[in-house]
Interface confidence: low
């Protein structure tokens, strides 16, 4: 019968020829005139057999990622008789893997959105690299992910590529971060190859800022001839949040005279001071009222940021009008 071990040839061998192994019939005692032949795809071009000994050589550099095995056929003929000594047999030459492919991130560019102030451990996104090397061959395609840029705000799970938040972030300080992830094969051991990808992580706004008046004191004037409903001036607060999180409502906190009202212009987010009752210079020529401002939408879990609404004082001077 045929005698051989399993045949392996390392890929990317630079030598002009590489000995793979030997095909032999157990009837070959060294005295026979046995001729070994190699047939099939690659025979005579990629692989050469020493027909006298059955030694097989690879004469071309092989790339496992292009082709991982070759199925060939072996024959042994007794030259003396011209007859086959053994039945023709099929055998396999496997191309063994070397770590010649770096991990590649195929789904880039990566982009993720995560709410600001998300707690530590919040999942942001999973990045996945693939490695064309053989996953069953040692650690050539076993990847470890690490963070090249993004500390201390982000971390990556070494085996999954899951990016998580490791420190709370405030959108009002920085609204986007570039995280660079490296995937290293060979589980990071010497000889490892690596690939990197960038992840743009954008922070979405949460209502973690209350509106605050721009001024602690506003001075307005109103003519005593002004009818009720007259807009006598505007007050303004600012809110570092954006969108609906910056929508605000103004209201009167103190007005003993109950002479004024404040309505909110939801387009400009200004407070408009309105005359609720007519004023009389001769009766009272100035007023002091206090206004407050609050956000329109505040989820329960964010109320801690909204204790003690911002207030401002408004001094209103009544202008005298000559009366007949």
């Amino acid at each position: 019968g045929w005698v051989w071990n399993q045949f392996f040839v390392p890929e990317e061998m630079n030598t002009t020829s590489h000995h793979i192994g030997q095909l032999r019939s157990d009837l070959d005692n060294g005295n026979n005139s046995f001729q070994y032949k190699l047939l099939g795809a690659g025979a005579g071009s990629t692989f050469i057999i020493d027909e006298r000994t059955g030694d097989i050589y690879a004469i071309q550099k092989l790339d496992r990622e292009e082709r991982s095995l070759y199925i060939l056929r072996a024959q042994v003929i007794d030259i003396a008789t011209g007859r086959a000594v053994e039945p023709e047999s099929e055998f396999v030459i496997k191309v063994s893997d070397i770590n010649d492919n770096e991990p590649k991130f195929l789904d880039e560019p990566y982009e993720a959105i995560v709410p600001e102030m998300s707690p530590e451990g919040t999942l942001v996104i999973q990045v996945t690299a693939s490695d064309a090397d053989d996953p069953s061959s040692g650690n050539n395609a076993r990847l470890l992910y690490s963070l090249l840029q993004g500390q201390p705000y982000f971390s990556v799970e070494p085996t999954t590529g899951v990016i998580r938040i490791s420190s709370k972030m405030d959108r009002e300080l920085q609204d986007e971060y570039w995280v660079i992830i490296q995937a290293k094969d060979m589980i990071g051991q010497p000889g490892a190859l690596s690939g990197t990808t960038s992840v743009l992580i954008k922070l979405s706004d949460v209502n973690d800022n209350k509106p605050i008046f721009k001024e602690s004191l506003y001075r307005l004037t109103v003519s005593e001839s002004a009818p009720t409903g007259t807009s006598i001036g505007t007050i303004m607060a600012y809110d570092n949040d954006i969108g609906e999180n910056a929508e605000m409502d103004y209201s009167i906190e103190e007005d003993d005279s109950q002479t004024f009202d404040i309505i909110t212009n939801h387009e400009t987010q200004e407070g408009i001071v309105i005359l609720k009752k007519k004023v009389d210079f001769e009766h009272q020529n100035h007023y002091g009222i206090r206004a407050k401002v609050k956000n329109h939408h505040v989820p329960e879990q964010l109320m801690k940021y909204h204790t003690e609404a911002s207030t401002t004082f408004i001094k209103i001077q009544v202008e005298d009008v000559d009366e007949p």
Epitope: P109, L148, Q149, W178, I180, T197, S198
Partner: antibody, heavy 122, light 108 residues
Framework: QVQLQESGPGLVKPSETLSLTCTVS????????WSWIRQPPGKGLEWIGY???????NYNPSLKSRVTISVDTSKNQFSLKLSSVTAADTALYYC????????????????WGQGTMVTVSS | DIVLTQSPGTLSLSPGERATLSCRAS???????LAWYQQKPGQAPRLLIS???SRATGIPDRFSGSGSGTDFTLTISRLEPEDFAVYYC?????????FGQGTRLEMK
């Protein structure tokens, strides 16, 4: 404002190694990507490769076997080495900066050096 | 590699006219990561447009960029004498970064 200045020999012999340095002034080399680009006389532009300040590199596959780009953050410099040069490597060599800050992704080149002419001749 | 083909090779126009320069990519440019540069003799290229349509700092608004996928255009709405130069497009959506061969804009 940030300025780039290339320096190095203007004449290199065939088969030798071309070595150029780009000095960054008016700003830090940190947190940006820095590229080398060349332009043969009367021809278009060819990207050679980049280096990030941490030392990671990416090279044009057409030149990869001959190119090494390195960085010296302490001197605010990065360098190009191109081995086994031939006359085809005669060109105006520019250093340039990606306009993206802390980006792993490429961006356009917003700042360029004035270029240094390198002739390969014996 | 992504190959960028610019047309026309040379464009002869007079000051005040409108210039339209084309850049076609051999495959789609990811994220419209395409830039335009102007280069005058003896000078380094100057960034005009990035992201296909965003003007760089200090670039006059007569320069505008448009396009996506494989077809991109640089338009100069009203040519000034200082606009006559060579214009290059560049893609940076995929490594290696590549440039077009250039369009020479000359005065008629």
């Amino acid at each position: 404002q940030v300025q780039l200045q290339e320096s190095g020999p203007g004449l290199v012999k065939p088969s030798e190694t071309l070595s150029l340095t780009c000095t960054v002034s008016g700003g830090s080399i940190n947190s940006y990507y820095w590229s080398w680009i060349r332009q043969p006389p009367g021809k278009g532009l060819e990207w050679i490769g980049y280096i990030y300040y941490i030392g990671s590199t990416n090279y044009n596959p057409s030149l990869k076997s001959r190119v090494t780009i390195s960085v010296d953050t302490s001197k605010n410099q990065f360098s190009l080495k191109l081995s086994s040069v031939t006359a085809a490597d005669t060109a105006l060599y520019y250093c340039a900066r990606d306009s993206r800050y802390r980006s792993g992704w490429y961006d356009a080149f917003d700042i360029w050096g004035q270029g240094t002419m390198v002739t390969v001749s014996s | 590699d992504i190959v960028l083909t610019q047309s026309p090779g040379t464009l002869s126009l007079s000051p005040g006219e409108r210039a339209t320069l084309s850049c076609r990519a051999s495959q789609s440019v990811a994220g419209s990561y395409l830039a335009w540069y102007q280069q005058k003799p003896g000078q380094a290229p100057r960034l005009l447009i990035s992201g296909a349509s965003s003007r760089a700092t200090g670039i006059p608004d007569r320069f505008s960029g448009s396009g996506s996928g494989t077809d991109f255009t640089l338009t100069i709405s009203r040519l000034e004498p200082e606009d006559f130069a060579v214009y290059y497009c560049q893609q940076y959506g995929k490594s290696p970064i590549t440039f077009g061969q250039g369009t020479r804009l000359e005065m008629k």
